[in-house]
Structure formats: C-alpha cells, structure tokens
C-alpha cells in the first residue's frame, strides 16, 4: 500500500487548511486514522465504526473531514511543522504519511505539492 | 438534564438471552455515541462495545463479538444490548454509558442493570 | 488489547492528604487515557479525560497528568467524600480497556 498526502502545503495566518492523506494500492481495511502534530500530540482520531475524537487542546481549531482527513482553522505561526497521518489497517498494519505545513504572514497564495511515501 | 434509565434487574436460566435496554432524555442522542460496559461483581470494567446512532457504526469487543448485539430505536432514543447463550460468567452489573461529544470517553453513564444466570 | 496496571489495589489515605494513583499501559496511548470515580452501589463517574483536562463540574482538587505510556491522577487534598474506586481507561484504541481499579481508603 501507500500514502499520498498533500505534501507541503502553505497557508494564510487565520486562514485555515485541509491535510488530507490517501491510502491507496492495497484491499486492507482502515480501522482507524490517527492525526499528530510536530511533537507527536494528538489532534484527533477517527476509528472506522465509532467517528471522530477530536483532542481537547484543538477542539476549536480542529474541524473533521473532509473524509478521513482534518481541517485545521484559525491557523498561527506556531501551527508551522510537521503533521503525520497514521492508518492503522487489517490485516497490513500501519501506514505513516507526513506533511508539512507552512504558516504564512503574508498574502502568499496557498498551494500543495502531492508526493507519495512508500 | 441528561438522564440513561436503564431496564430492571434480569433473573436468566444458562443458555437464555438476556435484552437490556437504556432509554435516554435531555440531549440529541444521535450526535452521541452509546458504550456498553460489564462489570463483574468487585472487579473491574470491562468494554463491551460502542454504537454510533447516527450511521449506525457499531465496535464491538471481540472477546463479545457475536454473542453481544447492540441497536438502538432512534425514534424513543432507546439503546440495546442483547447478550445470548448466558453462562455464569455473564452475572455482571451491565452499565450504557454516553460517549462525550467527539470524544471516546464516557461523560454520563446509566445505573446499571444487573444480570444474574443461574439455573 | 492494551493492558492497564493500576499497580496498588488498595491506598490508605487520611483526610486533607494528597495521594497519587498511578497506571501503566503497555504500549504508547499518547494522552488517551481517561479517569473514572465509581463509589460503592454507584456508577462510574467521569473525572478526567485527555488525560489532564478536568470534566465539567469536578473540583479542581483531581488532577491528571502523563502521557504515553505512565499517567498518574492525583487528589491534592482528599475529602471524605473522595473515598471511592477509581479506574483509568484508555481510549486510544479498540477494545478500549480499563484498568484493574484502586480503591481509596482511610487509615
């Protein structure tokens, strides 16, 4: 299998984003999609049957979806670095996807770069 | 006020099942998801599973995994739980428990219905 | 499945005390862990979640801390009324799992 991610992306401060990871080229089964930031705190969970658990820390900030994916709002300097998507599957087990993310002062138009990681 | 009243004690024979339920009052009970949880006499507690109303997302414990059905009746915002081919080891006190909004943990929890197998 | 130790079943305190439970799980829940008060003929009651954010209502005497695999809730300064069992549970993954349980009692 493999993850493809949005890549690098870049947004506006107090603007928001959507990091979207994709799992593809394998049958196996998502139970659940961990989110995490830069150092490893969680954002928020979506297992397969029981929906979204959103961290208390950005429940305010943290919108789920689109899909399994995560949009992140109100977006500060200090939400620049890195964020990872981790798909807990069966029967293949774990898929890891990263993304880094860049908080802009100034106007500078949002885009992405895709990539895969194997 | 959020309120679970949950259905009355159960007296069953081995090999019967058993059918508890846990009506709900005082929040939207779609947007919530509904836990099960055993707790054996002075022993701990133990997940049964979890139903989400609203696209009826069920997780089950699979050490309960087709003995333990779990429904609800949107209509009475009315949860279920049914436990077939009872055996001793099913005596417990039976707790449905509100899972927090988008979170997994349980904010408020029925009384508790306790179920006794014996012949 | 994930294994809770809560590793002392029973902790004798005195009132106005500050007493420490501790749990372990065996491997890493980030900070998916939640604490639940049950007190005798009652049901569980929900302290902390997220390992250190306090529910709605709860005096701010309980305190939860520790992430990964160590997490302690702590009473700063026990009332009688705290004398209960309490239970971690994690929420990281299914089945979530609780932990065998401490039950607070007085000297």
């Known amino acids: 299998g493999t993850i493809e991610t949005t890549g690098n992306i870049s947004a506006k401060k107090g603007g928001s984003v959507i990091l979207q990871c994709h799992l593809s080229s394998t049958m196996a089964q998502v139970t659940q999609v961990n989110w995490e930031q830069h150092d490893h705190s969680l954002l928020a969970i979506r297992n397969a049957e029981l929906g979204w658990h959103i961290y208390p820390a950005f429940k305010d900030r943290v919108a789920p979806g689109p899909g399994l994916g995560l949009t992140l709002q109100s977006l500060t300097m200090n939400d620049t670095g890195e964020y990872f998507c981790t798909y807990h599957t069966y029967p293949d087990g774990t898929y890891r996807g990263r993304i880094f993310l860049e908080v802009l002062e100034s106007s500078v138009a949002e885009h992405s770069a895709r990539f895969q990681i194997p | 006020e959020v309120q679970l009243q949950q259905s009355g004690p159960e007296l069953v024979k081995p090999g019967a099942s058993v059918k508890i339920s846990c009506k709900t009052s005082?929040?939207?009970?779609?947007?919530?998801?509904m836990h099960w949880v055993k707790q054996s006499h002075g022993k701990s507690l133990e997940w049964i599973g979890g139903?989400?109303?609203?696209?009826?997302?069920?997780s089950y414990n699979q050490k309960f995994k087709g003995r333990a059905t779990l429904a609800v009746d949107k209509s009475s915002n009315t949860a279920y739980m049914e436990l077939r081919s009872l055996t001793s080891e099913d005596s417990a006190v039976y707790y449905c428990?509100?899972?927090?909004?988008?979170?997994?943990?349980?904010?408020?929890w029925g009384q508790g219905t306790t179920l006794t197998v014996s012949s | 499945d994930i294994v809770l130790t809560q590793s002392h079943k029973f902790m004798s305190t005195s009132v106005g005390d500050r007493v420490s439970i501790t749990c372990k799980a065996s491997?890493?829940?980030?900070?998916?862990v939640a604490w639940y008060q049950q007190k005798s003929g009652q049901s569980p009651k929900l302290l902390i979640y997220s390992a250190s954010y306090r529910n709605t209502g709860v005096p701010d005497r309980f305190t939860g801390s520790g992430s990964g695999t160590d997490f302690t809730f702590t009473i700063d300064s026990v009332q009688a009324e705290d004398l209960a069992v309490y239970f971690c549970q994690q929420h990281y993954s299914t089945p979530f799992t609780f932990g065998t349980g401490t039950k607070l009692e007085l000297k």
């Open positions: 428990a509100r899972g927090a909004y988008y979170r997994y943990d349980a904010d408020y």
């Open positions: 491997q890493d829940v980030k900070t998916a």
């Open positions: 005082g929040y939207t009970f779609t947007e919530f998801t």
């Open positions: 139903l989400k109303p609203d696209n009826g997302g069920i």
